[in-house]
Interface confidence: low
Amino acid sequence: RAPRCRELPAQKWWHTGALYRIGDLQAFQGHGAGNLAGLKGRLDYLSSLKVKGLVLGPIHKNQKDDVAQTDLLQIDPNFGSKEDFDSLLQSAKKKSIRVILDLTPNYRGENSWFSTQVDTVATKVKDALEFWLQAGVDGFQVRDIENLKDASSFLAEWQNITKGFSEDRLLIAGTNSSDLQQILSLLESNKDLLLTSSYLSDSGSTGEHTKSLVTQYLNATGNRWCSWSLSQARLLTSFLPAQLLRLYQLMLFTLPGTPVFSYGDEIGLDAAALPGQPMEAPVMLWDESSFPDIPGAVSANMTVKGQSEDPGSLLSLFRRLSDQRSKERSLLHGDFHAFSAGPGLFSYIRHWDQNERFLVVLNFGDVGLSAGLQASDLPASASLPAKADLLLSTQPGREEGSPLELERLKLEPHEGLLLRFPYAA
């Protein structure tokens, strides 16, 4: 008799793929545009990325550092009208893209939560949650919560409002903290909160260090659902050299939890390469004309247009990983086991019941390494075969689909491999 299938866990929409942050509408659209109507025209692009949610804004009225002139119920006219927003929501829904609204109050000011009048601000947020839930948004984001006094209790209250409206609504909190204890204390009192932080932001040094950060986090958070990003708002290029971007895309898409990206992460958008552009929100490079300030500063391979035509580009890798992440059970909700693979490497297996299994091997170092996959670290339910098929490599030149001997797995510098193998009873 065939073994009984394991019962599938309840899956919320944000469990099924990546979230895509557009914190600055104008930078995202460029060319002096930057409104909700224009964003509607970019939804097909988001669909092509197979992201499940768009984290938008803030787009509300906010006079810098002025509580009285901050209205979380009103859209800043520069971004459009409430009708434009409703239209965006409807279009996004048709494309199965959820919209999460950022309600960080004083986003134009010094302190995101204002220095005083915490209770006034908290009440404004509460009213805004109820208003925008009625308007049809799928969730909310609040950032810089380290600046919010009694953040845990406010978050618990806002979570109750959000979940009270529907279990299908999401609350995301963002913090600049990279301290695990601070992160855990925020999570403790908020069961379903999705938290973005700077926890992984200094992970780029070695495979061992990254492995240790990831496993510590997962062990500490237990079986709660988590999110993976390098910060609450910034681009991957703020933290990583170009040669590690592919590796991190592979890792973020295959760890257990929701990967969260900022616009431009999919093409390796780098403010440092665009003189005069703000680090936190450089202009999105749709094509070579997106940054006319310095002629010739932008080459085709830096743009969405150029990378869309190149199957070996970062954008193409992003799309493939996003697609795999959204359809494979082992990546959607599978168990995770990290294990030793040798110095400089981070490797782990994702598996769910009798579904196809995935092996990820990441070489963070700048030398080629041979992986010695140490099966002793794995439970019997997650044992490794002698060979696994190469689904993709972050580096060009490998023959995809070919079986690789796991005992002889050699990785190029900064190479990541995604391998697949069948369940064996």
């Epitope: 110095p343 390494l369 041979s370 992986a371 010695g372 140490q374 002793s376 002889r408 050699k410």
Partner: antibody
Framework: EVQLVESGGGLVQPGGSLRLSCAAS????????MHWVRQAPGKGLVWVSR????????SYADSVKGRFTISRDNAKNTLYLQMNSLRAEDTALYYC???????????WGRGTLVTVSS | DIVMTQSPLSLPVTPGEPASISCRSS???????????LDWFLQKPGQSPQLLIY???NRASGVPDRFSGSGSGTDFTLKISRVEAEDVGVYYC?????????FGQGTKLQIK
Amino acid sequence: EVQLVESGGGLVQPGGSLRLSCAASGFTLSSSWMHWVRQAPGKGLVWVSRINSDGSSTSYADSVKGRFTISRDNAKNTLYLQMNSLRAEDTALYYCARWNWGWYFDLWGRGTLVTVSS
Amino acid sequence: DIVMTQSPLSLPVTPGEPASISCRSSQSLLHSHGDNYLDWFLQKPGQSPQLLIYLGSNRASGVPDRFSGSGSGTDFTLKISRVEAEDVGVYYCMQTLETPYTFGQGTKLQIK
């Protein structure tokens, strides 16, 4: 200091048994595949056996298959070679060696001498 | 089993002169990912073998740059650009492509 130290060799009669040990220090044995290589007096090197990191996979040279058993106790940081039904041609200096991540032998012990004679 | 054949079996060399040892395998040692699974060892008198070259051409750490390995498939060569007195001993090639791993017979390098 990273090193391997073999022990357990000695004089044994044909048909007898011996158990060789290889103690690892300065590194964790559990993270390495390990091998035994032997060298008869005045002769060349001959590979004998290997074991993977968790002991779940082993390989042997045809000349020792069915008589020798390689094993490991990762908790004790020790590798073993159980030798049964010994023959005169098994007389050799037995080395244990560490296999570096699927590429090469990067660390050898000093060897322990096994003499099979009546 | 893969058979490894070394030549010459004895190699008298004058210090400062170059030396070359050949190693042939009965089947190709070139793995599909591009590496040749052929290593070179030196066993000095009364000592354990020490690694000189791995994967055909990669010098092991601490090995002087006068040692170099070359070749691919079935034909490999170990070269010493200028032999020194401390280089005496027996040189072995070894294939680690598949078990049973096999060594060459050894080449004894002596100083003239």
